[in-house]
Amino acid sequence: IWELKKDVYVVELDWYPDAPGEMVVLTCDTPEEDGITWTLDQSSEVLGSGKTLTIQVKEFGDAGQYTCHKGGEVLSHSLLLLHKKEDGIWSTDILKDQKEPKNKTFLRCEAKNYSGRFTCWWLTTISTDLTFSVKSSRGSSDPQGVTCGAATLSAERVRGDNKEYEYSVECQEDSACPAAEESLPIEVMVDAVHKLKYENYTSSFFIRDIIKPDPPKNLQLKPLKNSRQVEVSWEYPDTWSTPHSYFSLTFCVQVQGKSKREKKDRVFTDKTSATVICRKNASISVRAQDRYYSSSWSEWASVPCS
Amino acid sequence: RAVPGGSSPAWTQCQQLSQKLCTLAWSAHPLVGHMDLREEGDEETTNDVPHIQCGDGCDPQGLRDNSQFCLQRIHQGLIFYEKLLGSDIFTGEPSLLPDSPVGQLHASLLGLSQLLQPEGHHWETQQIPSLSPSQPWQRLLLRFKILRSLQAFVAVAARVFAHGAATLSP
């Protein structure tokens, strides 16, 4: 058993049929010594008396808010949550496996630049009685500070018969060094509580591996005289790290016909312009990637040819 | 060429070679679906690699003030990785294919380190890996980790030379 926060405790249980459970001793936070009784949740049934209460925690029915009273007055509360371990593996019932980029990916994170700011998100089908708390650091043995905000519900989607809820959180490394080569990964820890079930999820990454620039901005076409060719130009996204002579991007320019089956013409360039042939009803798209490190490409920025 | 005394390197040549190094480092080990091996026992060989850290003057401001600190750091790293790529981690079994990009990568690391430090000039070369022989069973994992680490190192070096070529070239 360990304390998650004031008056909230997590009981770690090996979860299998007829498991013996964990013996837990609760102590009433009071100077009083006698006349103390204990109840669980809203029930008025007295579970025991005295300053301490010993219980055997085996299942969710044994978890909940234990309250000690004296003469009708509440003295203190202890909320017990359960953390299940099945076959040596902690349960992951609350969050959905996003399976990208690999199985057992519950948290996904992205950064738009090297400033030390990043966003993580996760999915669940649970809509009520759900709380999250997020902590992060750079490295684990001698952790350096990363500050995370509160997790918020960022999207709701319908997937078949189910509703899916996306939560996200923004974090910022306290003393980020954008130009340095990271040697210690960022660690992100999410505590999830659904009713009386506790679970924790972690992710470990370097900012360089989760970089995904915003799409190029101000995508423009300039027809070239007496030619089917056009000059496409664009700019670095505002959110990208500066100076651009140091934090450089490379670009992919694609000409795509109306039909998905049509052959795509692609050009790769380090410049912020390119000359391509504009086919009727086609569109021109440009995306960006870090020039020197193969992290994710941005989403496409597109304009129609006409 | 970067002379320890402080004259400028051939920024444009260094930029071209460092960008080639980035390409080679990724073709030698493309990132296959984030094969995440950080949790798999960190061997000394990959713990001891020199990193370009915050105080090494490799940021745009530091380069403007005095690029020598940064160039020396990059030089040390190039020598370190060049030695690693020549060690039995890469020359032993399981054999690399004769046309593996690791050979070109190895040669380019040497080429860039020589551009930074012509013969006859000597920066003290810290952190030469003292490598005890590796076992074949360790090598695939070690290669993976070294190449991943090298990708990060050469990315920073390439940014330095690109910025230098754009803003510090005479």
């Epitope: - | 030695k83 020549g86 060690s87 039995d88 020359t91 032993g92 079994e93 399981p94 054999s95 690399l96 004769p98 050979g103 490598l131 022989p133 076992q135 074949p136 069973w137």
Partner: antibody
Framework: EVQLQQSGPELVKPGASVKMSCKAS????????MHWVKQKPGQGLDWIGY????????NYNEKFKGKATLTSDKSSSTAYMELSSLTSEDSAVYYC????????WGQGTTLTVSS | DIQMTQSPASLSASVGETVTITCRAS??????LTWYQQKQGKSPQLLVY???TLADGVPSRFSGSGSGTQFSLKINSLQPEDFGSYYC?????????FGSGTKLEIK
């Protein structure tokens, strides 16, 4: 075509030393380690050790430490093995071979130790 | 150290027959195993590496299998040139050791 050309047969007296060579061609000599293997007449194969010609790093079978010394010369793409304090037990064919999974072997050097 | 136990020590077979040679490692060597053929007075020739990958130029009647501690080399439809000695060898860790060999003779 990859070739490992070993030096010719040796007849030496007990207590003496001998140095045999293995010249590599057809590949970049410093790209692969070079192993040495001993085979006594009518018997099996015994690994002696390897040298990495790139940095002259060596790895010996405990059994052959103090007996065999491996060296190499990058300029001539040649690996060497010196055997010291020879006895009749050292009479054997000695092979050099590049990485096991590449399958390149020298033709062998026959060493006879006899008074 | 990992020991390689090879069997049988010798084997007589006729042209056209199929034979199997086995090799057992004293520890898990995954697939870090090679098979060699050696003719009298000649250098060993690589047949199979990584337990089951046929070396260049090796006829498809040869096949390697196994992983972990149990391995085998199978020769289908024996040809006259297949007679000689066969060795397995691990390259999982030093010291690299060879099996004691299997002498394949014509019946």
């Amino acid at each position: 075509e990859v070739q490992l050309q070993q030096s010719g047969p040796e007849l030496v007296k007990p207590g003496a030393s001998v140095k045999m060579s293995c010249k590599a061609s057809g590949y970049t000599f410093t790209s692969y380690v070079m192993h040495w293997v001993k085979q006594k007449p009518g018997q099996g194969l015994d690994w002696i050790g390897y040298i990495n010609p790139y940095n002259d790093g060596t790895n010996y079978n405990e059994k052959f430490k103090g007996k065999a010394t491996l060296t190499s010369d990058k300029s001539s793409s040649t690996a060497y093995m010196e055997l010291s304090s020879l006895t009749s037990e050292d009479s054997a064919v000695y092979y050099c071979t590049s990485n096991w999974d590449r399958g390149y072997w020298g033709q062998g050097t026959t060493l006879t130790v006899s008074s | 150290d990992i020991q390689m136990t090879q069997s049988p020590a010798s084997l007589s077979a006729s042209v056209g027959e199929t034979v199997t040679i086995t090799c057992r490692a004293s520890g898990n060597i995954h697939n870090y195993l090679t098979w060699y053929q050696q003719k009298q007075g000649k250098s060993p020739q690589l047949l199979v590496y990584n337990a089951k990958t046929l070396a260049d130029g090796v006829p498809s009647r040869f096949s390697g299998s196994g992983s972990g501690t149990q391995f085998s080399l199978k020769i289908n439809s024996l040809q006259p040139e297949d007679f000689g000695s066969y060795y397995c060898q691990h390259f999982w860790s030093t010291p690299f050791t060879f099996g004691s060999g299997t002498k394949l003779e014509i019946k």
